[in-house]
Interface confidence: medium
């Protein structure tokens, strides 16, 4: 497994990581630690593991957190009620 | 090729349960979520849920929550929507349409063929 | 939940001819410069087809007479030569936030 660095799918990250886009080249895509509390993310990125290709910067919300909305268009990973 | 069968029609009282399966064949059944979506004679399309088919997590619309379970048998690779407390307004052909698995897009790129519910007394 | 609007609910055009379809969403579907639009068509007696996802990517198959434009809340299918097995139903559907919601659809006929 590639544990930082470029990757194509979940499969290739460690634990506690998955396949995102890049911040800085959106064609490259790059191990990324799931949400921690407090983190931004984007409330449809949940699926864990994804077997197909991420089209966001951000990771599902570690186990025990959720992705919700604190602001019209500001989500961040906050633990389930 | 890709194919989702789904159960035949049904036609059943208000206030009783329905169970809808779709059998997924042509692929990896657990790389792929499952939607299920309806739609009224001669209207348009209602999105009513999908599921992981590799750990069963699902996500409901919250017009349907309580009143929907959407299940999958990996050892059969079929998808089950069971909709309960049915009324008139439930009457719908009702589809089975697999998750393109385009990141998060949320696609459906294969559907099945519909299964007729009818609701009435 | 996200209102999606067509417009308009029914359109008839000659063979050959050009079929613009728009949407609008009562909200962005946006985010991170990625739209999060599909576009669908049912023809009579059959499941819908998946023709467009995010916005502007064709599907794997379909015509490339088929396009999809726009971002934000605005939206727009277009049939650059309308043939007469595009007759149909089609949907715009967002899937930026649950539920995801279907447009009324616009029926394409021919004139």
């Known amino acids: 497994a590639v544990i930082t660095g470029a990757c194509d799918k979940d499969s290739q990250c460690g634990g506690g990581m998955c396949c995102a886009v890049s911040i800085w080249v959106k064609s490259i895509r790059i191990c990324t630690p799931m949400g921690k509390l407090g983190d931004s993310c984007h409330p449809l990125t949940r699926k864990v593991p994804f077997f197909g290709r991420r089209m966001h910067h951000t990771c599902p919300c570690l186990p025990g957190l959720a992705c919700l909305r604190t602001s019209f268009n500001r989500f961040i990973c906050l633990a389930q009620k | 090729e890709v194919q989702l069968v789904q159960s035949g029609a049904e036609v059943k009282k208000p206030g009783a349960s329905v169970k809808v399966s779709c059998k997924a064949s042509?692929?990896?059944?657990?790389?792929?979520?499952m939607h299920w979506v309806r739609q009224a004679p001669g209207q348009g399309l209602e999105w009513i849920g999908y599921?992981?088919?590799?750990?069963?997590?699902?996500t409901y619309n919250q017009k349907f929550k309580g009143r929907v379970t959407i299940t999958v048998d990996k050892s059969t690779s079929t998808a089950y929507l069971e909709l309960s407390s049915l009324r008139s307004e439930d009457t719908a052909v009702y589809y089975c349409?697999?998750?393109?698995?385009?990141?998060?897009?949320?696609?459906?790129?294969?559907w099945g063929q519909g299964t007729l519910v009818t609701v009435s007394s | 939940d996200i209102v999606m609007t067509q417009s308009p609910d029914s359109l008839a055009v000659s063979l050959g001819e050009r079929a613009t379809i728009n949407c609008k969403a009562s909200?962005?579907?946006?985010?991170?410069?990625?739209?999060?639009m599909n576009w669908y068509q049912q023809k009579p007696g059959q499941p819908p087809k998946l023709l467009i996802y995010?916005?502007?990517n064709l599907e794997s198959g379909v015509p490339d007479r088929f396009s999809g434009s726009g971002s934000g809340t605005d939206f727009t299918l277009t049939i650059s030569s309308l043939q007469a097995e595009d007759v149909a139903v089609y949907y715009c559907?967002?899937?930026?936030?649950?539920?995801?919601?279907f447009g009324q659809g616009t029926k394409v006929e021919i004139k």
């Open positions: 349409a697999r998750d393109s698995n385009y990141g998060e897009a949320y696609a459906m790129d294969y």
């Open positions: 599921i992981s088919c590799y750990n069963g997590a699902t």
């Open positions: 909200q962005s579907v946006d985010y991170d410069g990625d739209s999060y």
């Open positions: 559907q967002q899937i930026n936030e649950d539920p995801f919601t």
């Open positions: 995010a916005a502007s």
């Open positions: 042509g692929y990896s059944f657990t790389d792929y979520d």
